[in-house]
């Protein structure tokens, strides 16, 4: 008799799963030599171990403590860069300024970057067909508690000032619902934090709003002032000329405005 | 079996640039960091930097900072190197390479190298 | 960067004898998980180098057991027990500690 499954509303777990992440955390140690210590194996089998065999609707952050413990790693506190809706440019920023940090330039959201997974109550199945969705299933899901545990635990080790990327294209450019909105904003700690700076990323060439005054911005400000940490806001209105002038500083068309 | 095979010879002039590949085979193109290493005729070997097929993601040497650009096609599983304003000094045999993983462990030397591609920069 | 320093740099051996050759960094290379980051590489005539030895003293798959590495975090030794003719070539080694990885100047070995 075949076994009844479960059907979700989301994509299923992305294919080669194991493999991915195995591989991936090799990668990582390869290329960051100060997280050799990490025994991928065991990264892999506390991975696995937060979601297999558990109900996928019921997933918490403690079933992913073995694995935060695992991969328990130290970024500079005053360099990391949050963002939301605009991963790709935020991923190419922290390409050329080496020395600044988005979660997914950590080992933890490397790992699990762009993947889905989920498992089955009472079989040690990967589920394959189908994961819960966020909206139409669950948000107690592997991959939205994990993403919230690990969002929750890089915002709490932010200090001094902390940067944070928002898509100026978006009709809410900044979104209480987004991950940034939700966790991040809530976790930077107060006696840590001087200043939350927001850099607001225009996607129209003839864009020369000031976006800023945006009322989803001054709603951020606003959460943040009330949580005693200062806000500025800054307007990238050329992002390929932003990120060309961080490649090249010294460029003579980098004093001006981007 | 692994196998890196390299695009053929390149005479250029100084001033010029050059695009080097690297196709790679029996294994899954996006689980394993790309090396590419230089050496000059007579000389030692100079490390110059690494891509991560599947992010994109690259380091370079110092030295090559701005002159250097790696990228990889997933599609073909093909990584290449190019290398701009050349100089007589960049003559040399282009190699990539990449590690061996020792039970879920990289090993930290250059298991696989590719068969080399000498680029002549000469006016 | 660290800077590997190999001795000899050219040495002549007779077939069937023991060959070593030295190697030494300017930073120790043991990492805080217990290896010890050198490699070794034998580069033949006319072709890419071949990994000999990894993590100071661990043979690469396919390499005859006369081939062995061993040394402290500084100083690093690889010996071959009875050369061989085919054993001819460049040898380097490397440090793969950190970035940038080095390679020492290589020794070249001859038969004599």
């Known amino acids: 008799v075949p076994r009844w499954r479960q059907q979700w509303s989301g994509p299923g777990t992305t294919k080669r799963f194991p493999e991915t992440v195995l591989a991936r955390c090799v990668k990582y140690t390869e290329i960051h030599p100060e997280m050799r210590h990490v025994d991928c194996q065991s990264v892999w089998d506390a991975f696995k171990g937060a979601f297999i065999s558990k109900h996928p609707c019921n997933i918490t952050e403690e079933d992913y403590q073995p694995l935060m413990k695992l991969g328990t790693q130290t970024v500079p506190c005053n360099k990391i860069l949050l963002w939301s809706r605009i991963k790709d440019l935020a991923h190419q920023f922290t390409q050329v300024q080496r020395d600044m940090f988005t979660l997914e330039d950590t080992l933890l959201g490397y790992l699990a970057d762009d993947l889905t997974w989920c498992g089955e109550f009472n079989t040690s199945k990967i589920n394959y067909q189908s994961c819960p969705d966020w909206r139409k299933d669950c948000s107690n899901n592997p991959v939205s508690v994990f993403w919230k545990t690990v969002s929750r635990r890089f915002a709490e080790a932010a200090c001094d000032v902390v940067h944070v990327m928002l898509n100026g294209s978006r009709s809410k450019i900044f979104d209480k619902n987004s991950t940034f909105g939700s966790v991040e904003v809530h976790n930077l700690q107060p006696e840590k934090v001087q200043t939350l700076e927001a850099w607001v990323i225009h996607g129209g060439r003839e864009d020369s709003r000031d976006l800023c005054q945006d009322p989803t911005i001054k709603e951020l400000e606003s959460i943040i002032s009330k949580r005693n940490i200062q806000f500025s806001c800054k307007n990238i209105y050329r992002p390929d000329k932003f990120l060309q002038c961080v490649k090249n500083p010294e460029d003579s068309s980098c004093t001006s405005e981007i | 079996q692994v196998q890196l095979v390299q695009s053929g010879a390149e005479v250029k002039k100084p001033g010029a640039s050059v695009k080097v590949s690297c196709k790679a085979s029996g294994y899954t193109f996006t689980d394993y960091i790309m090396h590419w290493v230089r050496q000059a005729p007579g000389q030692g070997l100079e490390w110059m930097g690494w891509?991560?097929?599947?992010?994109?993601?690259?380091d370079y040497a110092q030295k090559l900072q701005g002159r250097v650009t790696m990228t990889a096609d997933t599609s073909t599983s093909t990584a290449y190197m190019e290398l701009r304003s050349l100089r007589s000094d960049d003559t040399a045999v282009y190699y990539c390479a990449r590690v061996a993983i020792i039970t879920t462990v990289a090993s930290g030397g250059f298991a696989y190298w590719g068969q080399g591609t000498l680029v002549t920069v000469s006016s | 960067d660290i800077v590997m320093t190999q001795t000899p740099l050219s040495l002549s051996v007779t077939p069937g004898q023991p060959a070593s050759i030295s190697c030494q960094s300017s930073e120790s290379l043991l990492h805080s998980n217990g290896k010890t980051y050198l490699n070794w590489y034998l580069q033949k005539p006319g072709q890419p180098p071949q990994l000999l030895i990894y993590?100071?003293?661990t043979r690469a798959a396919g390499v005859p057991d006369r081939f062995s590495g061993s040394g402290s975090g500084t100083d690093f030794t690889l010996k071959i027990s009875r050369v061989e003719a085919e054993d001819v070539g460049v040898y380097y080694c490397q440090q793969f500690l950190e970035y940038p990885p080095t390679f020492g100047q290589g020794t070249k070995l001859e038969i004599k």
């Open positions: 891509i991560d097929p599947e992010y994109g993601s690259t």
């Open positions: 993590w100071m003293s």
